[in-house]
Interface confidence: low
């Protein structure tokens, strides 16, 4: 609810390239970058290979005219490079850019993927596409470091073991392990390629009867998390053609053996649904271990409408299924494509997540933003941005989501989405939040055998009520205006029932008090008001609500950005509930004891008048 | 309603300084931004920069750094631009305008004061 | 700084016909973008923000369009009193940069 959608900060690439296939925020030093996968764009450093793909660096700050420059690589011009023993590689359509991630630390590397990449050494026998991954070091600049984790010497077949592994359609960095999707291994049964980085070693999955799944593409998504304990990292794989409706699994990374280790497994629910081809590891709700949502974009009601599927951490990897997600559930949608953790995007001490439904609108595609809680997911999205409404250049806008860094430098993280098929990367930032605390001050009940006060005319009852506002949140500005409305008696107004209590303001009577405040940072502003009780009320039992709905106005000042236009602040977002506080009284009962029970007894007689 | 109203005409010899005072009403001035914009004769319009009131907070152009100084009396809701070391690239006509940092509209001034007359000559 | 060129300078036309109005920014400014009408003697008006809305109280024969880093504002029938120069200002960042005016009369 608080990404601004109206000042979007707009990458362009070139044409038919795919650019915006993925998307990533990163951060070297002080500078902040988004990197976008162009996985069908021409490379300028390899001008003689036919399509390799690419990865652009585009700068945030300091670059007026939004330009984006390709990534050097250092891979070389020439063509069928010697890349081992038994290796010439073929970059041609290799797809370079198809997967970006990121190490989570401050000089984090970067890892970018060509899962198309192809060892042609055996070129008589079979073309291998075991897939290409290069580590960029943070800076960007210095040469990096290749990785062809399927390549094996002297193996030559091309659906046995790893020959047609396609090894970095997904990736996933964490600060130890760089994890790899490799969904070809096995006759497409599919692995996971894991790095350890502090040792150099691949983790094994010798789980056979992962491995016999032939056509399960496991490893089509991958990420990782902590879902056995606070302080290890598992592994997470999506084998989203499992048995045609889709698996996902966890492993743990066990390093004496050097093995991954399943330790749990959940399937979808309908056939075609591609549950499993995506996935994001996010501690929801704050309890120290990662929850899982699991995309099945394909899922179908009327037509690949798509699902996310929400499992909370009970403890020790047992995941509980929470309930499913389908955003707007629109025709043909795809929602669930993509799912990005932001981390807390609103400041509200829970992550938050991103689901993109590239498809929705007729491919102008669509991001939806939900919230974690203390309970896990709050089921309704905060925020529905629409690509259309965007720019209406934008199609498939949600494909590819990345988030979690603070772009603009205003405190909150921002998010950054791709639509590869216009060629876009859209930067929208997060505006601060604003909690405003709101008191409604009412006597503990109204004294209604002794009229306190006067109308004009004769001794009525009455009572105090005392509105009391402050607002805080991070890099918010220092004064703001508020516009709030007090209402009386609001359950009878909801019911459209007459109030029985109204304002007295200057001589006048109103049925609510419309007021604009300005308001000091920290700083508590009171308003005192004077209710009057109406004369014969009838219902002394049902209490009185007051209610308080607020909204900032029109001249709220943001702190100025440097290079950034400034962004005006907005509320905290209640859940979906009105933005307003509430408080009651009751009428005295002048009871002796707090149970009130009446003691009526009635009598009847029956009249009968003959016509 | 919304008023600025700016002091009267000005005429400066080179070197000294001057300064021109904005006298807002009908609104809360400490909420919105106080501009300062240059007009000089068969030129456009320049900003100088703005000041806002409530926290005393200023922002100018570069180009006037060290040229204008922009201050603010929140007691009589009146703003100042003082211009100094006058030369004659400084005459010009100066306006004052109010805007404010909206979501919806930017930084765009919607009420503008009548204009301050400065001509420096000896 | 970001640069507004407008164009024309200068325009005669009739009382009843449409006019269009040029400003081109030296780089995306994303909407933000301000017209100002200027009468002899007066001090500027705000007519259109975010490049297309329409400011209080102005008439709408007035109107703006365009995106990225050009934006146009249209007179759909002149009047008398639409005699004046016209500035388009962007609002993006700072310094805000103000286009050269056209100055547009009754011919």
């Known amino acids: 609810y608080n990404l601004d959608p109206q000042r979007p900060v707009h990458f362009q690439g070139p044409a038919d390239s795919f650019f915006g296939y993925a998307v990533l925020e990163h951060f070297h030093d002080n500078t902040r970058w988004v990197l976008v996968g162009a996985p069908k764009a021409d490379s300028k450093y390899s001008p003689s290979v036919k399509s390799p793909g690419a990865v652009f660096k585009c700068r945030v700050h300091t670059n007026p005219d939004r330009r984006c420059t390709e990534l050097d690589m250092a891979r070389g011009k020439n063509r069928g490079t010697s890349c081992g023993k038994t290796c010439r590689e073929d970059r041609d359509d290799e797809w370079m850019g198809v997967s970006l991630a990121r190490q989570p630390k401050a000089d984090g590397r970067v890892l970018a993927c060509a899962h198309r990449w192809k060892n042609i050494y055996y070129e008589a026998d079979h073309i291998l596409p075991h897939g290409f991954c290069y580590i960029i070091p943070s800076n960007l600049q210095a040469k990096g470091r290749t990785l062809i984790p399927c390549y094996e010497e002297y193996k030559k077949k091309y659906g046995e073991e790893h020959g047609s592994c396609q090894a970095g359609i997904a990736g996933f960095f964490t600060e130890e392990l760089v994890v790899m999707g490799a969904p070809g291994s096995f006759y497409w049964a599919g692995t996971i390629k894991v790095l350890n980085l502090t040792d150099n070693t691949y983790l094994k999955l010798n789980d056979e009867v992962i491995m016999n799944r032939r056509y399960t593409y496991l490893g089509y998504a991958v990420t990782a998390g902590h879902f056995s304990h606070p302080s290890t990292i598992d592994v997470v794989g999506g084998a989203p053609q499992d048995k045609g409706i889709g698996k996902v699994y966890i492993f743990r990374a066990d390093r004496r053996s050097g093995t991954l280790i399943k330790i749990f497994q959940a399937s979808g629910k309908k056939m075609g649904s591609y549950f499993g081809s995506s996935l994001c590891a996010v501690d929801l709700n704050g309890d120290g271990l990662s929850d899982l949502l699991v995309g099945a974009p394909m899922f179908s009601e009327i037509r690949d409408e798509g699902q996310v599927t929400v499992y909370i951490n009970r403890g020790n990897g047992a995941l509980e299924e929470q309930l499913a997600l389908t955003g707007d559930g629109a025709y043909n949608a795809h929602f669930g494509e993509s799912i990005a953790s932001l981390d807390d995007l609103d400041n509200d001490g829970f992550p938050d997540v991103a689901i993109g439904a590239p498809k929705e609108d007729d491919f102008a595609g669509a991001v939806y933003i939900y919230h974690g809680d203390a309970g896990g997911i709050v089921p309704q999205y905060s925020m529905k941005l629409s690509g259309q409404k965007i720019n209406p250049v934008l199609r498939m806008f949600g494909q590819s989501i990345s988030g979690g860094i603070d772009m603009d430098g205003n405190g909150y993280p921002d998010v950054t989405v791709g639509a590869f098929m216009s060629d876009s990367v859209v930067l929208l930032r997060a505006r601060p939040v604003i909690t405003v605390d709101v008191s409604i001050f009412l006597p503990g009940s109204i004294n209604i055998t002794a009229p306190q006060c006067h109308d004009g005319q004769q001794p009525v009852n009455c009572l105090n009520v005392t509105t009391c506002f402050s607002f805080h949140g991070k890099h918010v500005p220092g004064e703001i205006g508020l516009n709030y409305v007090l209402m009386a008696d609001v359950a009878k107004k909801e019911k459209g029932q007459m109030p029985r209590v109204y304002f007295v303001l200057l001589g006048e009577t109103m049925g609510q008090v419309t007021e604009k405040l300005q308001l000091t940072y920290m700083e508590e502003t009171c308003r005192h008001y004077v209710a009057h009780v109406k004369r014969r009320v009838q219902d002394v039992i049902s209490p009185i609500v007051f209610e308080a709905a607020y909204s900032l106005s029109e001249h709220v000042t943001g702190e100025e950005e440097r290079e950034l236009p400034p962004l005006t602040p907005v509320l905290r977002w209640k859940k979906g509930q009105k933005i307003a506080q509430k408080n009651q009284t009751v009428f005295e009962r002048n009871c002796r004891s707090e149970d009130c029970a009446a003691d009526l007894q009635l009598q009847g007689k029956l009249l009968l008048s003959s016509m | 309603q919304v008023q600025l109203q700016q002091s009267g005409p000005e005429l400066v010899k080179p070197g000294a300084s001057v300064k021109i005072s904005c006298k807002a009403s009908?609104?809360?001035?400490?909420?919105?931004?106080m501009n300062w914009v240059k007009k000089r004769p068969g030129q456009g319009l320049e900003w100088i920069g703005w000041?806002?009131?409530?926290?005393?907070?200023?922002k100018y152009n570069e180009k006037f750094k060290g040229k204008a100084t922009l201050t603010a009396d929140t007691s009589s809701s009146t703003a100042y631009m003082q211009v100094s070391s006058l030369t004659s690239e400084d005459s010009a006509v100066y306006f004052c305008?109010?805007?404010?940092?909206?979501?919806?509209?930017?930084?765009?001034?919607?009420?503008w004061g009548q204009g301050t007359s400065l001509t420096v000559s000896s | 700084d970001i640069q507004m060129t407008q164009s024309p300078a200068s325009l005669a036309a009739s009382v009843g016909e449409t006019v269009t109005l040029t400003c081109r920014a030296s780089?995306?400014?994303?909407?933000?973008l301000a017209w100002y009408q200027q009468k002899q003697g007066k001090s500027p008006q705000l007519l259109i923000y975010?490049?297309?809305s329409l400011e209080d109280g102005v008439p709408s024969r007035f109107s703006g369009s365009g995106s990225g880093t050009q934006y146009s504002m249209k007179i759909n029938s002149m009047q008398p009193e639409d005699t004046a120069t016209y500035f388009c200002?962007?609002?993006?960042?700072?310094?805000?940069?103000f286009g050269g005016g056209t100055k547009l009369e009754i011919k």
């Open positions: 200002k962007q609002a993006y960042d700072v310094p805000y940069t």
């Open positions: 009908g609104y809360s001035f400490t909420s919105y931004y």
């Open positions: 975010n490049a297309n």
């Open positions: 780089e995306n400014i994303y909407y933000s």
């Open positions: 305008a109010r805007s404010w940092v909206s979501y919806e509209r930017g930084y765009y001034f919607d009420y």
């Open positions: 000041i806002f009131p409530g926290s005393g907070n200023t």
